[in-house]
């Protein structure tokens, strides 16, 4: 019974001491996206590189078919950056034509899918109106936060327009998660 | 069978239980930049405050000559924010003069230097076109992600134009890393 | 001398081994803000949801009256995203009227309050000029970094204009912290 003095006895049960180096972790990097079917009103999911270059998955965190699979329940820090790039936005064209200024937008959503729950859960959203004056524009949206996930949960990154995603370099567009 | 020692069963070896408080960590904050020589086509590196105010380095994570030195191999979360500020961008001036709209841009790169590899590795990049209408503009670029680093690796933050960096406050422009 | 096998003997003293699952953690999400008195020249603080939806506090990290209370000294990763939205900015109106282009701005500050110190400390600031051409604009500001906090410290998120904060969805505007 020695050692119980350091903490409530229940803690050994749900959160035993463990080596940090064996925690599930992943950093995924952008690759060229192949256009895929997606439902109207549903943002398409990005697919990712998971072992070449800076990308890796380790300690039972697996990547398959656009999803990061959570192998163990716990609190995870999840992050993503998507760099968008485009030509003059529609807003700019509309403005020049003297019509109402409805801005375009770019959006990134990190989504959780739980088999036992019918609807995906949006964990994080970054959304920005784009009403650029220059002929070419580019900009990143960064997201990151901590969430309690369950074993078997799946994470994906959805974007408003897959054709605007900058896939040219692994340091510009990425997605990761690690167990705290 | 040489080399097998590095695979799965190894985890107790390279990642024993250890106190979280003794992990390498640093948070560096902005200082006024002194203009320095840098190669054409190579972004200049920022230098940082490492012990005054909010800044600190601890547990063998050292800062020297614009670099954070990684004292121990492992997975690190690395982050930086750079706040840029400027006068009306060239893009805006060009637009008024009726010339083509080539936008200016601002870029932050977190770079890794490994002595055993000739080329620096770009870990993270945030890049944004700047085509502002107002006479003065300012905006941050934030980056953060997890990377597997080796003992002896060096990290730095490079920017596209050092003269646009807002060095007025330690909370606006910063750079940090911690072992997970 | 039992236990020395796990780590250098000094570690037991200042940072005992502890289960990751019992570390103070919180993720707070946006709710509709009620207009409150705040001093001129002082940004108003946001209040937050702390237990419904994605929001949670755990392991003695408590939320009360706009503040996250730090229950234990150590190094914390602190983050927030605030999504702003507005109509055509004043800058745009000013420009059309031919007056000088003083841009509007949006600002987020993560502030630390320490009872033993009279002034709040600004830990993180994200500030951006807003000079949009479109009639409606929206955009996030994200912040995140590591800080050494003391037991009893209080954290809050302040914004330049509470009426511009998008409180419609818990994934758009949030605030969190966790002990490393």
């Amino acid at each position: 019974l020695k050692g119980q003095e350091f903490a409530p006895s229940h803690q050994q049960v749900y959160a035993p001491l463990r080596a940090d180096g064996d925690k599930p972790r992943a950093h995924l990097t952008v690759v060229r996206q192949t256009p895929t079917q997606h439902f109207k009103n549903q943002f398409p999911a990005l697919h990712w590189e998971h072992e070449l270059g800076l990308a890796f998955t380790k300690n039972r965190m697996n990547y398959t078919n656009k999803f990061l699979l959570i192998p163990e329940s716990g609190d995870y820090f999840i992050y993503s950056q998507v760099t968008f790039r485009g030509m003059t936005s529609e807003c700019s064209e509309i403005r020049q034509a003297g019509r109402p200024n409805k801005p375009d937008s770019i959006t990134v959503v990190i989504t959780k899918v739980t088999d036992s729950y019918p609807e995906p859960t949006q964990l994080l959203m970054g959304t920005k109106s784009v009403c650029e004056v220059g002929s070419n524009w580019f900009q990143p949206i960064y997201l990151g936060a901590m969430f309690s996930l369950q074993e078997g949960d799946k994470l994906m990154v959805n974007v408003s327009d897959i054709s605007l995603v900058d896939y040219t370099k692994e340091d510009k567009t990425f997605f990761g998660a690690f167990l705290l | 069978l040489k080399g097998q020692e590095f695979a799965p069963s190894h985890q107790q070896v390279y990642a024993p239980l250890r106190a979280d408080g003794d992990k390498p960590r640093a948070h560096l904050t902005v200082v006024r930049q002194t203009p320095t020589q840098h190669f054409k086509n190579q972004f200049p590196a920022l230098h940082w405050e490492h012990e005054l105010g909010l800044a600190f380095t601890k547990n063998r994570m050292n800062y020297t000559n614009k670099f954070l030195l990684i004292p121990e191999s492992g997975d690190y979360f690395i982050y930086s924010q750079v706040t840029f500020r400027g006068m009306t961008s060239e893009c805006s001036e060009i637009r008024q003069a009726g010339r083509p709209n080539k936008p200016d841009s601002i870029t932050v790169v977190i770079t890794k230097v490994t002595d055993s590899y000739p080329e620096p590795t770009q870990l993270l990049m945030g890049t944004k076109s700047v085509c502002e209408v107002g006479s003065n503009w300012f905006q941050p670029i934030y980056l953060g992600a997890m990377f597997s680093l080796q003992e002896g690796d060096k990290l730095m933050v490079n920017v596209s134009d050092i003269s646009l960096v807002d060095y007025t406050k330690e909370d606006k422009t910063f750079f940090g890393a911690f072992l997970l | 001398l039992k236990g020395q096998e796990f780590a250098p003997s000094h570690q037991q003293v200042y940072a005992p081994l502890r289960a990751d699952g019992d570390k103070p953690r919180a993720h707070l999400t946006v709710v509709r803000q009620t207009p409150t008195q705040h001093f001129k020249n002082q940004f108003p603080a946001l209040h937050w949801e702390h237990e419904l939806g994605l929001a949670f506090t755990k392991n003695r990290m408590n939320y009360t009256n706009k503040f996250l209370l730090i229950p234990e000294s150590g190094d914390y990763f602190i983050y927030s995203q605030v999504t702003f939205r507005g109509m055509t900015s004043e800058c745009s109106e000013i420009r059309q009227a031919g007056r000088p282009n003083k841009p509007d701005s949006i600002t987020v500050v993560i502030t630390k309050v320490t009872d033993s110190y009279p002034e709040p400390t600004q830990l993180l600031m994200g500030t951006k000029s807003v000079c949009e051409v479109g009639s409606n604009w929206f955009q996030p500001i994200y912040l995140g970094a590591m800080f050494s906090l003391q037991e009893g410290d209080k954290l809050m998120v302040n914004v330049s204009d509470i009426s511009l904060v998008d409180y419609t969805k818990e994934d758009k505007t949030f605030f969190g912290a966790f002990l490393l």
């Epitope: 690759v31 060229r32 590189e49 998971h50 072992e51 070449l52 270059g53 800076l54 896939y167 040219t168 370099k169 692994e170 | 080399g3 590899y117 000739p118 080329e119 590795t121 770009q122 | -």
Partner: antibody, heavy 123, light 111 residues
Framework: EIQLLESGGGLVQPGGSLRLSCVAS????????MSWVRQAPGKGLEWVSV????????YYADSVKGRFTISRDNSKTTLYLQMNSLRAEDTAVYYC????????????????WGQGTTVTVSS | QSVLTQPPSVSGAPGQRVTISCTGS?????????VHWYQQLPGTAPKLLIY???NRPSGVPDRFSGSKSGTSASLAITGLQTEDEADYYC???????????FGGGTKLTVL
């Protein structure tokens, strides 16, 4: 000494299949990206496919996508290229080449090449 | 049509200096990806000549050098020798193709 030895080439009719092999020696095979590169008679080099060290990531040139499959057996230090629905324009010498480690994939060249195996697609 | 553009042929007399250019785009060389050069002697497999824009593998004479700027790269050979007569290929990574790309090759003739 590092060596790559290709085999499996030959004459095949259009629409047919062939499986190329490349046996590696002299280096830690599983630590390196491997690739297939081909050279049509009198023409230049054309990259065909690449595979990561563990085999989990694969990429293909558009000209062979959906018809060719790259794979590896790290226990046998062997790289494979399964070629289906072959066409006359697939006629070439096929080289197996060693790339860099997974980490430097985007930035490394091919530092070791096999001697090549000839594939002829003709009726 | 190759993704990277090289001149089909160059020539020079023994002892002279020749350069071979390699022009790419914003999805390969211009994106910051390294350029590598290969030498293919008649009837043999290609051999790595320059890696990472300007580095020579051991055994490659210092008469061979590489450089890169913007969306293009070049290979320089000084003190030309008859045994340098070969085909030379540049190669890089191309993000829009998710793979490696080669130039069309340049035949070097030593006069």
């Amino acid at each position: 000494e590092i060596q790559l030895l290709e085999s499996g080439g030959g004459l095949v009719q259009p629409g047919g299949s062939l499986r190329l092999s490349c046996v590696a020696s002299g280096f830690t095979f599983s630590s390196y990206v491997m690739s297939w590169v081909r050279q049509a008679p009198g023409k230049g080099l054309e990259w065909v496919s690449v595979i990561s060290g563990s085999g989990g990531s694969t990429y293909y040139a558009d000209s062979v996508k959906g018809r060719f499959t790259i794979s590896r057996d790290n226990s046998k230090t062997t790289l494979y290229l399964q070629m289906n629905s072959l066409r006359a324009e697939d006629t070439a010498v096929y080289y197996c080449a060693k790339g860099g480690t997974n980490y430097y994939y985007y930035y490394s060249g091919m530092d070791v090449w096999g001697q090549g195996t000839t594939v002829t697609v003709s009726s | 049509q190759s993704v990277l553009t090289q001149p089909p042929s160059v020539s020079g007399a023994p002892g002279q200096r020749v350069t071979i250019s390699c022009t790419g785009s914003s999805s390969n060389i211009g994106a910051g990806y390294n350029v590598h050069w290969y030498q293919q002697l008649p009837g043999t497999a290609p051999k790595l000549l320059i890696y990472g824009n300007n580095n020579r593998p051991s055994g490659v004479p210092d008469r061979f050098s590489g450089s890169k700027s913007g969306t293009s790269a070049s290979l320089a050979i000084t003190g030309l020798q008859t045994e340098d007569e070969a085909d030379y290929y540049c190669q890089s990574y191309d993000s829009s193709l998710s793979g490696w790309v080669f130039g069309g090759g340049t035949k070097l003739t030593v006069l």
